[in-house]
């Protein structure tokens, strides 16, 4: 039995996967910030987690996925105000009783030190210094991500 949040997450990911392939992104769009091989958009307004998820989707992006502690720290360094929380693409899967990224993978317990409970209708937010479990209905800011396409040097055979 999937919760409404889980269903929303799955539906949006599936609709994103169905869209036609677009040419790779070489530069970040206006108002987006580059962080390594990603473009990040830090929202100014606030929304519950599922609206944030949907908003990123309309921008042909996804809620932020964090690979490891190093990427978390670099992302947190871009947050200017220590009091502000941002949704990322991680929520509690009731059916699997585990934290699950919106791409379907599970959280490696070593990656993020989460403050708060792992329970139904819990979603993950980050601040300048910490990672929190919040009720998914809480209205806070959010971070969208787009992957940059790496520019590969063309290798020409000897003439």
């Amino acid at each position: 039995q999937k919760s409404s949040i889980e269903k929303c997450s799955v539906d949006i990911q599936q609709s994103r996967n169905k869209t036609t392939e677009r040419p790779g992104l070489l530069n970040c769009p206006i108002y987006w910030q580059q962080l390594r091989e990603k473009c990040l958009l830090f929202s100014h307004t606030v929304n519950p987690w599922n609206n944030s998820l949907a908003d990123c989707s309309t921008k042909e992006s996804s809620l932020l996925l964090i690979r490891d502690k190093d990427e978390l720290i670099h992302t947190q360094n871009l947050i200017r105000d220590k009091a502000i929380l941002f949704w990322i693409g991680l929520n509690f899967s009731l059916s699997e009783k585990n934290w699950k990224w919106i791409n379907g993978s599970f959280l490696n317990s070593n990656d993020l030190e989460i403050r708060g409970d792992a329970k139904e209708n819990s979603c993950i937010s980050i601040s300048q210094t910490s990672v929190y479990s919040e009720y998914c209905s809480t209205e806070i800011r959010w971070i969208c991500q787009k992957e940059l396409t790496p520019v590969r040097n063309k290798v020409y055979p000897d003439s």
Partner: antibody
């Protein structure tokens, strides 16, 4: 180049509903938020509200009870309805692109609405 | 009554600098770095000049600059030119997805 164009009836009777549409060209409506702003003759600007393309809306608290906004992504349009209008609602109405919900980088040319019986 | 307070008028001679203030509260200007400025010539739509307090969109001359101290934001126009004569409006995010404008300042180039 992004362009916005307001359209609708220029004359509305008191107590009736003002309806305006903004058509966006040169950009997909889906990637941004969109706002309505008005300016009574000789006065300052007033933010009316914004719509996200997922359908979520934020309205100016002073107008919230009378405002409805909607979006039609297939037509690249968004709309404003303001009910129970009075003479105080007569103004030039602007639609604008609202990229992050805190500023307006592209504006329509403006549309004059007169309220009179 | 506008939520943000601007002086009704400001003036300067060509080549001079003029600063227009925009005073709010800790709930709007003082509480967020989301102040923007717009220039409006008579009969025209407003033009986007400054966002996030200090950032200038492409195409806006670097004679225009923004700053903020406490609950007051400022727009400075240096090297004043005749075409800068217009109305200027500030705007600020006011929390919980709300947004407010100032009453506007008429800038006259003497």
């Amino acid at each position: 180049q992004v362009q916005l164009q307001e359209s609708g009836p220029g004359l509305v009777k008191p107590s009736e509903t003002l309806s305006l549409t903004c058509t966006v060209s040169g950009d997909s409506i889906s990637s941004y938020y969109w706002s309505w702003i008005r300016q009574p003759a000789g006065k300052g600007l007033e933010w009316i509200g914004r719509i996200y393309t997922i359908g979520t809306t934020n309205y100016n608290p002073s107008l919230k009870s009378r405002v409805t906004m909607s979006v039609d992504t297939s037509k690249n349009q968004f709309s404003l309805k303001l009910n129970s209008v009075t003479a105080a609602d007569a103004a030039v109405y602007y639609c604008a692109r609202d990229p992050l919900g805190t500023f307006f980088d592209y504006w329509g040319q403006g549309f004059l609405v007169t309220v009179s019986s | 009554q506008s939520a943000l307070t601007q002086p009704p008028s400001a003036s300067g001679s060509p080549g001079q600098s003029v600063t227009i203030s925009c005073t709010g509260t800790s709930s709007d200007v003082g509480g967020h770095n989301y102040v923007s400025w717009y220039q409006q010539h008579p009969g025209k739509a407003p033009k986007f000049m400054i966002y996030e307090v200090t950032k200038r969109p492409s195409g806006v001359p670097d004679r225009f600059s923004g700053s903020k101290s406490g609950n007051t934001a400022s727009l400075t126009v240096s090297g004043l030119q005749a075409e800068d004569e217009a109305d200027y409006y500030c705007s600020s995010y006011a929390g919980i997805n709300n947004l407010v404008f100032g009453g506007g300042t008429k800038l006259t180039v003497l």
